[in-house]
Amino acid sequence: EQAPGTAPCSRGSSWSADLDKCMDCASCRARPHSDFCLGCAAAPPAPFRLLWP
């Protein structure tokens, strides 16, 4: 969960309570058990288009 009173993390990053800062979702490839990686899995890393109108 995001710390109260902090700005949301930018796209492609997620809040780490352990480190008390936003962390890059890309680093979850190397360190998948990091606390912030749960937040990364919840949203796609890049926008995608629906296949229907």
Partner: antibody, heavy 120, light 111 residues
Framework: EVKLEESGGGLVQPGGSMKLSCVVS????????MSWVRQSPEKGLEWVAE???????????HYAESVKGKFTVSRDDSKSRLYLQMSSLRPEDTGIYYC??????????WGQGTSVTVSS | DIVLTQSPASLVVSLGQRATISCRAS??????????MHWYQQKPGQPPKLLIK???KLDSGVPARFSGSGSGTDFTLNIHPVEEEDTATYYC?????????FGGGTKMEIK
């Protein structure tokens, strides 16, 4: 402010040994991967060794092929210190040795470096 | 090992113009989502400093005149407009697999 400070460099004869140290402040040391990277005019920037964190597979270590069996990287999380024990040193091991801290991938935090010269 | 080839080895750029530096990897360093390529700046007598991570993400405090792009095997660092303080050597580095390797560097001078 994050600070990494290397020490232990100097002049050593071929075949000799040397131990480098790096003290880290301003960083939750125990959570960060640490590496040694060296730089010389001949070889440019060359990654030497890495030690991961205790929570990730018991502080796994990795080495460049050129230093395997010669160099040993270790860490003391209670002192926020990183070490590089070097043995059987050769002239090609000469260079500036940097201590680096990073969570993963990109190398965020660099020390100022310590110079190692292997010469008779 | 993944070999990173930078070009040019050196360049001279006029103040206010654009500088473009390329880095080519001997194999892909990208997934469908992220590229594991990073850029560093090194000034004489100083350690390298992280500029851009994951091909295009500026590190904190890095001026917006720096930008990175690319995926797969081809990556580019752009600086525009170039300022005098940008005189330095620039390196790419991958974190796809061990051993981590660096490019040979591009030395940039400003005229």
């Amino acid at each position: 402010e994050v600070k990494l400070e290397e020490s232990g460099g100097g002049l050593v004869q071929p075949g000799g040994s040397m131990k480098l140290s790096c003290v880290v402040s301003g960083l939750t040391f125990s959570r960060y991967w640490m590496s040694w990277v060296r730089q010389s005019p001949e070889k440019g920037l060359e990654w030497v060794a890495e030690i991961r964190v205790k929570s990730d597979n018991y502080a796994t270590t990795h080495y460049a092929e050129s230093v395997k069996g010669k160099f040993t990287v270790s860490r003391d999380d209670s002192k926020s210190r990183l070490y590089l024990q070097m043995s059987s040193l050769r002239p090609e091991d000469t260079g500036i040795y940097y201590c680096i801290g990073y969570y993963a991938d990109a190398m965020d935090y660099w020390g100022q470096g310590t110079s190692v010269t292997v010469s008779s | 090992d993944i070999v990173l080839t930078q070009s040019p080895a050196s360049l001279v750029v006029s103040l206010g113009q654009r500088a473009t530096i390329s880095c080519r990897a001997s194999q892909s360093v990208s997934t469908s989502s992220y590229s594991y390529m990073h850029w560093y700046q090194q000034k004489p007598g100083q350690p390298p400093k992280l500029l851009i991570k994951y091909a295009s993400k500026l590190d904190s405090g890095v001026p917006a005149r720096f930008s990175g792009s690319g995926s797969g095997t081809d990556f580019t660092l752009n600086i525009h407009p170039v300022e005098e303080e940008d005189t330095a050597t620039y390196y790419c580095q991958h974190s796809w697999e061990i051993p981590w390797t660096f490019g040979g560097g591009t030395k940039m001078e400003i005229k």
